[in-house]
Every structure is written in structure tokens, then in C-alpha cells.
Interface confidence: medium
């Protein structure tokens, strides 16, 4: 598994370097998670043909994964820092149950899946410190999450592979949008 941000050899070798700003830490954290997702996607695509699945089949999914929309204020047109930050944090909190689902889905990248999950928790903490309006952030209901997790694990192999592929693809897109938006803040 890759070394978490702040623990790489460059940090150790350069103790007098300026500490990372809050924004730099967040940026680095997201890029670290994206690297992890790439590794997981590689295993998924090697194992099954889901990565070549037609857009039509993917569009049919009923997973309700978090997605950026115009109203969320994260795009350049209509950008709204506060609304966008709330959307990013809320989205990441909603992704947590899906990241939990991924934990049993990898054989050779088991550590990588765990690293993505734990790094996302850290990213949420970073972002919550940055947010002024924490009241606007809705936390997913644990009971709903538990039953969703049970339902996902109760699928057959084909559906589980498709679900894994969709989660990784959607999470990657969500993080990429978040990264672009956070760089404007």
C-alpha cells in the first residue's frame, strides 16, 4: 500500500520544510486517494469485463451514488464555496458505506482498499475543520446504511463486480470534481 500523505520519504528527509497548509494537505489527501482508486480499478478491470460495459448498462444502475450537480455550486459557473463544501463533505459521508462494501471485494489489493477507506475518513475530518456551516451537513442514517450494505453483499457475483466498478468510477469522478472545486477556495 502507498505511504499515507505526510509520511513519505521526502517529508522525513526534509524536516525543516514548511509544514503543509490546510489546503495543501487536503489536495494531497485527495490525490493520494485517487492513486488508491486507480490501483483498485486496475484489479477490477483485470478480473472482469465490467470496465468495457456499455454506458447504457451503467446508466441503469440504481445505486444512488453521490454525484455533483449544477445546484451544488462546485462547478465554475455558479460556484459557491459554502454550498460546495457542504456538498463535498455530505457526498464523502454518503460514500463511506460503499467504501465499507469494497473491503471484501479485493484479493491482491486488500490493503489498498483499506487505505482508501481510512484516508477518506481523514479527508472528511480535514474538510469538517474547514467548513463554517457544519449544521448544513446531513449524516447518513446508520440503520439505512446497514441495510444497504446487507443488500449489496447479497448480490450475485456479476452484480457485485458491476457494483464495485460503479462505486470506484463514481468515487473517482466525485473526488476529481471536489479537487477542482477545492482549488478555487
Amino acid at each position: 500500500a502507498p505511504v499515507p500523505p505526510g509520511e513519505d520519504s521526502k517529508d522525513v528527509a526534509a524536516p525543516h520544510r514548511q509544514p503543509l497548509t490546510s489546503s495543501e494537505r487536503i489536495d494531497k489527501q485527495i490525490r493520494y486517494i485517487l492513486d488508491g482508486i486507480s490501483a483498485l480499478r486496475k484489479e477490477t478491470c483485470n478480473k472482469s469485463n465490467m470496465c468495457e460495459s456499455s454506458k447504457e448498462a451503467l446508466a441503469e444502475n440504481n445505486l444512488n451514488l453521490p454525484k455533483m450537480a449544477e445546484k451544488d455550486g462546485c462547478f465554475q459557473s455558479g460556484f459557491n464555496e459554502e454550498t460546495c463544501l457542504v456538498k463535498i463533505i455530505t457526498g464523502l459521508l454518503e460514500f463511506e458505506v460503499y467504501l465499507e462494501y469494497l473491503q471484501n471485494r479485493f484479493e491482491s489489493s486488500e490493503e489498498q482498499a483499506r487505505a482508501v477507506q481510512m484516508s477518506t475518513k481523514v479527508l472528511i475530518q480535514f474538510l469538517q475543520k474547514k467548513a463554517k456551516n457544519l449544521d448544513a451537513i446531513t449524516t447518513p442514517d446508520p440503520t439505512t446504511n446497514a441495510s444497504l450494505l446487507t443488500k449489496l453483499q447479497a448480490q450475485n457475483q456479476w452484480l457485485q463486480d458491476m457494483t464495485t466498478h460503479l462505486i470506484l468510477r463514481s468515487f473517482k469522478e466525485f473526488l476529481q470534481s471536489s479537487l477542482r472545486a477545492l482549488r478555487q477556495m
Epitope: A57, N61, N104, E107, Q153, A154, Q155, N156, Q157, L159
Partner: antibody, heavy 120, light 111 residues
Framework: QVQLQQSGAELAKPGASVKMSCKAS????????MHWIKQRPGQGLEWIGY????????EYNQKFKDKATLTADKSSSTAYMQLSSLTSEDSAVYYC?????????????WGQGTSVNVSS | DIVLTQSPASLAVSLGQRATISCRAS??????????MNWFQQKPGQPPKLLIY???NQGSGVPARFSGSGSGTDFSLNIHPMEEGDAAMYFC?????????FGGGTKLEIK
């Protein structure tokens, strides 16, 4: 060729436990889930659960959650099912079946079945 | 749990004629454009044998006389023309979600 060889018939007393085996050959054991199915004489088929031999991950039909325990031994390419607290309701033929997964899941190869007779 | 209701419970068909068995699911067994419905044939003293998977695809070595159709909640298995060796029990099975369930079975006999 692919074969699933199940252990012989079991005669057990009420309250006892039995452990049956399903030895796989002709394919890579860890690459496919293994299912277990129950069939009572002259009746339909009931899915008990599956095990992923590669990870040991199991999913059970809630009905059999406290009755059956699925395990797998990678070194001998053998799947096992233990049935506990036996009653006359457990008298049945039990099949193991490989879940062949290419693009959809199918139970393509089945064992010959293990007959369990619970009687005092 | 998804309940599968097969009909008829028993059926007698003359050699060379068509046999049609229906299977209705209590909820849709479709997902991502695939119908997760399989059909099995079982003869006395033998394990079930896969005939049709994903509603309409023939299993390996299954004669073209066996065909499957349907989507959502309604499915059917057709055998035409009926042959001597087709007398058996037939089961539908959904594998969309745990617990995987089977229909009650249809006993097909020669008239």
C-alpha cells in the same frame, strides 16, 4: 474435466452433527464460489448458502444461518458443510454446486449429492 | 425473499409436441439489463442439470429444443419437439439476490 465428489451417506441421531465434504478437481478451486443446496425426498430445492474459497467469505440463507456452517480447505480443494442440532427435518440430499462465473453466475457442475438420514 | 411460482405443477405432452412451463417471480429479477433467471432439469436419482441461464441462454451441451424467454417477473421454458428423454422435473431459479431461490418444480411426463 470438472468434478465435484461428495462424501458418502450419513446416518445420524437427532441432536447430533454431521460434516460432509465436496472435493473439487479439474479446475482452480479458489476461482469459483461453491454453493450448497438441500433437497428433501420428492420435494423442491432450497439454497443453503455459498462460500468463496479464496477468501472464506460466506453468505447464508437466513433459514439455515444457525443450522449450516460452510468452510473450505484450499490445500485439498475441498469444501465442507457442517449441519448441527439435527432433526428429522434435516433428512435430505445435500448437493454442492460450483458457481461458474464468466459473464453471469450459473451453477454449472453439481456433486452427486450426500444423503443425510436423521433417525433415532 | 424472492418467491418463484411455477405452473403447471405437472404436465403431460405428446412426443413431438411443445411443452411450456411458466415461472413468475414476486419481484423483478432484472439488473443492469440482465434477467437473473436460470432453468434446471432433474431426473430421478441425479443432481439438477443447467438448461438455460440469464433467461434465454443455453447451457453447455443443451439441445436447441430447449429455449427460455421472459424478463422482469414473467419467464417461460419451452421444449419443442418433445422427446422421450425430456420426461423429468424442471425448476426455475433466481440468482439476483440472496437467498437464491427455486420454483416449486414442474413434473413433465410423456402423454
Amino acid at each position: 474435466q470438472v468434478q465435484l465428489q461428495q462424501s458418502g451417506a450419513e446416518l445420524a441421531k437427532p441432536g447430533a452433527s454431521v460434516k460432509m465434504s465436496c472435493k473439487a478437481s479439474g479446475y482452480t478451486f479458489t476461482s469459483y464460489w461453491m454453493h450448497w443446496i438441500k433437497q428433501r425426498p420428492g420435494q423442491g430445492l432450497e439454497w443453503i448458502g455459498y462460500i468463496n474459497p479464496s477468501t472464506g467469505y460466506t453468505e447464508y440463507n437466513q433459514k439455515f444461518k444457525d443450522k449450516a456452517t460452510l468452510t473450505a480447505d484450499k490445500s485439498s480443494s475441498t469444501a465442507y458443510m457442517q449441519l448441527s442440532s439435527l432433526t428429522s427435518e434435516d433428512s435430505a440430499v445435500y448437493y454442492c454446486a460450483r458457481d461458474y462465473y464468466d459473464y453471469e453466475d450459473v451453477m454449472d457442475y453439481w456433486g452427486q449429492g450426500t444423503s443425510v438420514n436423521v433417525s433415532s | 425473499d424472492i418467491v418463484l411460482t411455477q405452473s403447471p405443477a405437472s404436465l403431460a405432452v405428446s412426443l413431438g409436441q411443445r411443452a411450456t412451463i411458466s415461472c413468475r417471480a414476486s419481484e423483478s429479477v432484472d439488473g443492469f439489463g440482465i434477467s437473473f433467471m436460470n432453468w434446471f432439469q432433474q431426473k430421478p436419482g441425479q443432481p439438477p442439470k443447467l438448461l438455460i441461464y440469464a433467461a434465454s441462454n443455453q447451457g453447455s451441451g443443451v439441445p436447441a429444443r430447449f429455449s427460455g424467454s421472459g424478463s422482469g417477473t414473467d419467464f417461460s421454458l419451452n421444449i419443442h419437439p418433445m422427446e422421450e428423454g425430456d420426461a423429468a422435473m424442471y425448476f426455475c431459479q433466481q440468482i439476483k439476490e440472496v437467498p437464491w431461490t427455486f420454483g416449486g418444480g414442474t413434473k413433465l411426463e410423456i402423454k
